[in-house]
């Protein structure tokens, strides 16, 4: 199956080049998308590419600059957020990030009405997160760990927290390992839908072991990085939820929100807070031991000004195969009653499906169901459920968006995008605008990326938004590579992989083959997208063929393949990858003396795995900033999947499914190991530790490792990785250079 | 020369509403925002409220917040204010005002150009 | 809201003279970012409008003679007219653009003694 814009004649083909490195290196065939930022139910907002913030509204086809292009520039502006009442803009600068999600900024504010900066009152610096009230113009804040209310912004600022402290106590954002492996996000405040009153959460990290890492900097002596990081079985942030009327928030203060007696009994987490209305809210909880999970609905209490949670609203979510939810415990979306709800978990057959829940979670009514998995619930209106899954021709690697009329009995059911541009686009999301009066779709691929504008209620395209043109003609004298995604059925498992192939790939030719493998619980690999990126380039220049390959513990294809990995990480995964290389090496094409494997993060750990796995496939393999023991990685993701590493639960598993232990299994392989001095997330100690062991075995191997950079090796960095890397395979292969 | 011509003089009834006009020339309308203020008998200056031009938005002083309409029309390069629920106490002259839009962090900018006035006159 | 006080409510100046004029903001009018006084002065003759004299506490608009001149800075600011001239005597105002709601000081009138 050829998933890439068709190709010229032969006659043309010798105009044609082959993709560069520094192709890659530069972004020459990056593609750009369009999100609408949405302000009403026709009207959005964009950045031109003059960088003027311009309103456009859909339904009489007008546009105006909203913020000048002159105002931007003269503080430096990267990012920008109009008020509700479309009286002031905050305008975001100084951006420094911190970790995944995190960063600081300074925020002006520019009032619309006066053609002028606020200049009374002004925010503090540097500043945490902000973010306006979903009515008006009153801003929250976090500032050093505490958080703080305007009512308007140049209004005095209310303090709501005093006790927030540099990694001892968060407010209003979370702390490392939430951040991170929980909420996704870098706040952890809520408004309610009218903006009376805000919740927010606390994270205490007092008693959290601390990671501390060397910044070499350029100082004389380097700095030393202090995080809060709870690894696999050690002590956890302790989590409390507090709401405050933002409209008397002197008046009672901020009121705790009880967690559920069955969470509350041990150890548990937060998983997400969600308004229903300004005087219902719904909490999210999860025992420690991540296979249940509790969603609570919590009104408020006039009378006592206090917010209650009857047991009568709390519904459980348990998984007796695996851990609950997929990679994270869905969140739900309510329907316009205000009590029932919407929300994606496993049905009997073991499929992630749309449930409606009006009482009790046992009397759902599934909405969606099959042998696919319905992805994200984008929008639910008075007459339609948006949504994506991937069941079209049973493709798990796609995305279309699809509507079901829940106004009407029968429910039916419509793909929106199935049709759409079949051959370009099978790789969708979606952006609504609010009551879903209208939507952007943007499509991924396998084609160039386009987004387009449509009707909600009829679906009927409006506008095309962005068709990447530019990046359509650089490629048009490109010999891109081919690709295709199959699947191979091997002891009652599917595998599907997709295969990038050299321009000129002829069967009866051998090529050298390198595995590209991620492999997390819950990830998928094989994608309809389109990408011209490093193993394009491998692909495309030095002929190479690229696999990827989704195994056990990979997402949207049913629980079975998803929690095959539970409590066993490590293991099926890396058999999964070897057995579709025998499979390839079948095909007839690979050269099975020039095989290779790479991965990062994950990957990484996956990759060595399978390195060191003594099948004797492999010639050579990277690990970039792999996990090596699962004892080194966060709690909260780690024991999601392992339990704990004690001896009553799962230590066992954790020490046999290190990297180390298999450290004399990679005396007949060449290994190249990278890792970031600086990384937070996956720390040094993990290739550090690897590098020690294979010493110990007195096993030669390659390593490089980047000073001061984190997971993402970005920057300069980033080049001289793909180009070391490159040398590296180049080397394995026999290439020349 | 920059001009803001104003409506003319007024008289209503208490509970009645007033719209006056401020027509502007000789500038780029789009560059100024446009302030009204009023001045009671023997009273200081009072600022009602201003709009900028380009989105229309208006803001208004809290204590006028509710029976204050401030618009433009910016094709004809004209500014209103309209005062509903008018009382005795709102007899005054009315005056528009522009005042630069400040695209810089570092600027800001005082009324330099002023309507010539409208007297309101409210009386039963 | 900022609160604007003039003193004196009204001062007698011989022709050629010179006449003081003070005004006091409730809240700094200093801008920490720019180091400039978001202070305006106006002149007010009988039966027209004002007319915007200084800006930024002690800048000249365009065309007003040189005999105003306008200092201070922070809360306390001084309009000073070096020499009296008979189409001086109006009312004069000081006026804060620092923040919303913009607000006036009650007037100074100035004659002639």
């Known amino acids: 199956i050829v998933l890439r814009p068709s190709r010229v004649h032969n006659s043309e083909e010798n105009t044609m080049r082959a993709l560069t490195l520094k192709d890659i290196l530069n972004g020459t065939f990056s593609y750009k998308t369009f999100f609408p930022n949405w302000i009403s139910g026709q009207e959005y907002l964009h950045q031109s590419a003059d960088n003027n913030i311009v309103l456009y509204n859909i339904e009489t086809g007008q546009s105006y600059t909203i913020l000048s292009n002159r105002t931007m520039k003269s503080v430096n502006a990267s990012n920008y957020g109009l008020s509700p009442d479309r009286q002031f803009v905050y305008l975001e600068s100084d951006y420094s990030k911190l970790w995944r999600y995190s960063y600081t900024a300074t925020y002006y504010i520019y009032d619309l009405s006066n053609g002028e900066f606020v200049r009374g009152n002004e925010l503090p610096r540097p500043i945490q997160y902000l973010c306006w009230s979903p009515v008006g113009s009153k801003l929250a804040y976090v500032y050093q760990n505490n958080i703080y209310l305007k009512q308007r912004p140049g209004d005095p600022p209310f303090q709501i927290t005093f006790n927030g402290r540099e990694n001892k106590i968060f407010n209003g954002i979370p702390d490392w390992v939430y951040e991170e492996e929980m909420l996704a996000t870098k706040y952890a405040l809520w408004w309610s839908p009218n903006g009376k009153f805000l919740a927010y959460a606390e994270f205490n990290d007092t008693d959290i072991p601390v990671i501390a890492y060397s910044y070499y900097g350029d100082e004389q002596y380097p700095r030393t990085i202090n995080i809060p990081y709870p690894k696999a079985g050690a002590k956890n942030p302790v989590v409390r939820i507090f709401i405050i009327d933002t409209t008397y928030p002197a008046y009672v203060g901020p009121q705790e929100v009880p967690v559920p007696a069955m969470i509350a009994s041990s150890d548990y987490y937060f998983s997400w807070l969600t308004w229903v209305t300004d005087e219902r809210v719904c909490l999210q909880w999860l025992k420690r031991v991540q296979n249940v999970s509790v969603l609570s609905i919590c009104d408020f209490r006039e009378d006592w000004q206090t917010w209650d949670c009857p047991k009568t609203q709390e519904h459980i979510e348990e998984s007796r195969t695996g851990w609950a939810g997929g990679f994270f415990v869905s969140t739900p979306v309510f329907s316009y009653d205000a009590i029932s709800y919407y929300k994606i978990f496993s049905d009997k057959d073991g499929y992630k499906h749309i449930h409606y829940i009006k009482d009790t979670v046992e009397n759902a009514i599934q909405i969606t169901s099959g042998k696919w998995e319905a992805i994200n619930i984008f929008r639910v209106t008075q007459d339609s459920l948006f949504y994506s899954s991937n069941e079209f021709e049973e493709y798990p690697g796609r995305r279309n968006i699809y509507r079901i009329s829940i106004g009407s009995y029968p429910p039916s059911k419509k793909c929106v995008t199935c049709h759409l541009r079949k051959e370009r686009c099978q790789y969708y999301t979606a952006s609504f605008s609010d009551y879903a009066k209208y939507y952007a779709l943007v499509c991924y691929g396998p084609g160039i990326p386009i987004s387009t504008l449509h009707d909600g209620r009829t679906d009927q395209e409006i506008k095309i938004l962005e068709e990447n043109k530019e990046l359509e003609n650089a490629l048009k004298n490109i010999q891109l590579p081919k690709e295709e995604i199959k699947k191979l059925e091997v002891d009652e498992i599917t595998l599907w992989y997709k295969m990038i192939l050299p321009p000129q790939f002829d069967r009866s030719k051998k090529y050298p083959l390198l595995i590209q493998v991620y492999g997390g619980p819950c990830s998928q690999s094989v994608r309809s997208v389109f990408a011209v990126n490093w193993i394009s380039y491998l692909a495309s220049k030095e002929g190479m063929v690229i696999a990827l390959v989704d195994g056990r513990g990979t997402a949207f294809q049913g629980d079975k393949l998803l929690y095959a990995v539970y409590r066993k990480l490590g293991v099926y995964e890396v058999e999964d990858q070897i057995t579709a290389v025998r499979k390839f090496i079948e095909m007839g094409f690979i050269d099975e003396k020039r095989i290779a494997i790479w991965g990062w993060s994950y990957g990484g750990y996956v990759s060595s795995l399978a390195l060191a796995s003594g099948t004797g496939l492999f010639k050579c393999g990277i690990a970039v900033a792999p996990v090596s023991s699962w004892e080194y990685y966060a709690s909260v993701y780690t024991e999601r999947f392992m339990g704990l590493p004690t001896k009553d639960d799962n230590l066992e598993h954790y020490k046999n499914s290190t990297v180390m232990a298999r450290a004399e299994y990679f005396r007949n392989v060449d290994y190249l190991l990278i890792h970031g001095t600086a990384d937070d997330n996956v720390h040094f100690q993990n290739s550090a530790q690897i590098a020690k062991a294979l010493v110990n075995a007195q096993v030669d191997f390659q390593a490089m490792w980047y000073s001061d950079q984190n997971h993402g090796l970005s920057g300069l960095s980033t080049n001289h990785l793909y180009t070391h890397m490159t040398h590296f395979l180049k080397q394995c292969f026999s290439l020349s250079d | 020369q920059v001009q803001l011509v104003q409506s003319g003089a007024e008289v209503k009834k208490p509970g009645a509403s007033v719209k006056v006009s401020c027509k502007t020339s000789r500038y780029t309308f789009t560059e100024y925002t446009i302030h009204w203020v009023r001045q009671a008998p023997g009273q200081r200056l009072e600022w009602i409220g201003g709009i900028n031009p380009n989105n229309g938005i208006p803001n208004y002083n809290q204590k006028f917040k509710g029976r204050v309409t401030i618009t433009v029309d910016t094709s004809a390069s004209t500014a209103y204010m309209e005062l509903s629920s008018l009382r005795s106490e709102d007899t005054a002259v009315y005056y528009c005002?522009?005042?630069?839009?400040?695209?810089?962090?570092?600027?800001?900018?005082?009324?330099?150009?002023w309507g010539q006035g409208t007297l309101v006159t409210v009386s039963s | 809201d900022i609160v604007m006080t003039q003193s004196p409510d009204s001062l007698a100046v011989s022709l050629g003279e010179r006449a003081t004029i003070n005004c006091k903001s409730s809240e700094s009018l200093l801008y920490s970012r720019n180091q400039k006084n978001y202070l305006a002065w106006y002149q007010q003759k009988p039966g027209q409008p004002p007319k915007l004299l200084i800006f930024w506490a002690s800048t000249r608009e365009s065309g007003v003679p040189d005999r105003f001149s306008g200092s201070g800075f922070g809360t306390d600011f001084t309009l000073t007219i070096s020499s009296l001239q008979a189409e001086d005597v109006a009312v004069y105002y000081c006026q804060q653009y620092f923040s919303y709601p913009l607000t006036f000081g009650q007037g100074t009138k100035v004659e002639i003694k």
């Open positions: 005002a522009r005042r630069r839009i400040a695209y810089g962090y570092d600027e800001g900018h005082a009324m330099d150009y």
